[in-house]
């Protein structure tokens, strides 16, 4: 990792915690001012590779709400509203770190953790691959 | 929030600490297999909404490299190759949690942020505004 | 319980109309895809058209210049128009319920009981 | 289109016995999502189509667990473990991958 200069006004830690437990304010600083992503915009509906929303709950993880989106189609919608399958519509994936409780339901300790969540679709040319 | 039964193992907290600052163990549970995405998949290349990948790098952030997508076109890639305005690329956002060094530089002490971040691009049917 | 009971079906002539019709009950159409497949006498399955949870349709492209599908979801019914029939188009009619949406798997779990078209003059 | 080529189109069985079938399609059925929409059907004598297995390996609710499906990309096989007189009939693979959705020609399964 990156070598930070330890400012006096810090926080005490002992080497033996550190850096594996830290201490973490929960109350979020929000950087925008996105809502739900079901209502935040409707691209969802629009695009050619469209995808409907699924809600994800697990109280023992920070957020315990997280939408996973799920690719309508194996093809992609053209504008006559038929499916092309000679294109495919994918799911575009990112890794997010979420918080989970640990031990087991306890309020104030957590652990990270990475999780891989589908964010929407988008339509790609297919590799194909033929018999020889 | 959901209510959680105290765990009598759980770490010690005092009301006055709690739930505004939690201890987080940083050792990393991976639920998947995901590497860096330029390398995870083609997508970016092979949409019709391609999009392009930056690095957005911070040091008082963790993670501290966040990879940023920027869609190449304004409209969508036809099968020749041509860009159709007659649709738009679009970039698909998410919003995620980071952790925030404060105090800056405190190499033990963060505070949970959100970022709405560009994962990827997808291709959608523009709404049409017609003038009166 | 899901079932699919398709209706319509009869003798026609050769470059005649006809229109089947699929009742759905036990589940909604914007809820999941809906298939026909045919089956000639003593032959195979061989796929026609599907209509999506959202509307959008799927065609076998050496049939879709005659044949058009479509719904109505206040009577959960699907249909399919075909025009310009053949002696080769003669077969049992089936609709099938894909798992589509709900569950992603894009097979068809339920199948109705079928209705025989006879193109002959 | 994908064609869909089955092995044995007939194939009788003792009651008891295992049976097995082959399917090979003349394209890759991999998704560019990495799934394999590939599945079994049986069509009992008199009877509409029913699903056994879908998406290669995937048994459906119902289906006894003497049916097994595997394979990948362009190979696959149903296995029966055990044949029973009531498994008789047409047993079609299909693929949804590709556009126009297409079935193999069938095998007939009969007892001995």
């Known amino acids: 990792g990156i070598a930070i200069p330890r400012n006096s006004g810090c926080p005490n830690s002992e080497d033996k915690n550190f850096p594996r437990t830290v201490m973490v304010n929960l109350n979020i600083h929000n950087r925008n001012t996105s809502t739900n992503p079901k209502r935040s915009s409707d691209y969802y509906n629009r695009s050619t590779s469209p995808w409907n929303l699924h809600r994800n709950e697990d109280p023992e993880r920070y957020p315990s709400v997280i939408w996973e989106a799920k690719c309508r189609h194996l093809g992609c919608v053209k504008a006559d509203g038929n499916v092309d399958y000679h294109m495919n519509s994918v799911p575009i994936q990112q890794e997010i770190l979420v918080l989970r409780r640990e031990p087991r339901h306890c309020p104030n300790s957590f652990r990270l953790e990475k999780i891989l969540v589908s964010v929407g679709c988008t339509c790609v040319t297919p590799i194909v691959h033929h018999v020889a | 929030g959901i209510a959680i039964p105290r765990n009598s193992g759980c770490p010690n907290s005092e009301d006055k600490n709690f739930p505004r600052t939690v201890m987080v163990n940083l050792n990393i549970h991976n639920r998947n297999t995901s590497t860096n995405p330029k390398r995870s998949s083609d997508y970016y290349n092979r949409s019709t909404s391609p999009w392009n990948l930056h690095r957005n790098e911070d040091p008082e952030r963790y993670p501290s490299v966040i990879w940023e997508a920027k869609c190449r076109h304004l409209g969508c890639v036809k099968a020749d190759g041509n860009v159709d305005y007659h649709m738009n690329s679009v970039p698909i956002q998410q919003e995620i949690l980071v952790l925030r060094r404060e105090p800056r530089h405190c190499p033990n002490s963060f505070r949970l942020e959100k970022i709405l971040v560009s994962v990827g691009c997808t291709c959608v049917t523009p709404i049409v505004h017609h003038v009166a | 319980e899901v079932q699919l009971v398709e209706s319509g079906g009869g003798l026609v002539q050769p470059g005649g109309s006809l229109r089947l019709s699929c009742a759905a009950s036990?589940?909604?159409?914007?809820?999941?895809?809906v298939h026909w497949v045919r089956q000639a006498t003593g032959k195979g399955l061989e796929w026609v058209s599907v209509?999506?949870?959202?509307?959008?349709?799927t065609y076998n492209s050496a049939l879709k210049s005659r044949f058009t599908i479509s719904r109505e979801n206040a009577k959960n019914s699907l249909y399919l128009q075909m025009n310009s029939l053949r002696a080769g188009d003669t077969a049992v009619y089936y609709c099938?319920?894909?798992?589509?949406?709900?569950?992603?798997?894009?097979?068809?779990?339920?199948w109705g009981q079928g209705t025989t078209v006879t193109v002959s003059s | 289109d994908i064609v869909m080529t089955q092995s044995p189109l007939s194939l009788p069985v003792t009651p008891g016995e295992p049976a097995s079938i082959s399917c090979r399609s003349s394209?890759?059925?991999?998704?560019?999502?990495?799934?394999?929409?590939f599945h079994w059907y049986l069509q009992k004598p008199g009877q509409s189509p029913q699903l056994l297995i879908y998406?290669?390996?995937n048994r459906f609710s119902g289906v006894p667990d003497r049916f097994s499906g595997s394979g990948s990309g362009t190979d696959f096989t149903l296995k029966i473990s055990r044949v029973e007189a009531e498994d008789v009939g047409v047993y079609y693979c299909?693929?949804?991958?590709?556009?126009?959705?297409?079935f193999g020609q069938g095998t007939k399964l009969e007892i001995k």
């Open positions: 394209q890759s059925l991999v998704h560019s999502n990495g799934d394999t929409y």
């Open positions: 209509i999506w949870s959202d509307g959008t349709t």
């Open positions: 299909s693929q949804t991958t590709h556009a126009p959705f297409t």
């Open positions: 998406k290669v390996s």
């Open positions: 036990g589940f909604s159409l914007d809820s999941y895809g």
């Open positions: 099938a319920r894909d798992t589509h949406y709900r569950l992603y798997y894009y097979a068809m779990d339920y």
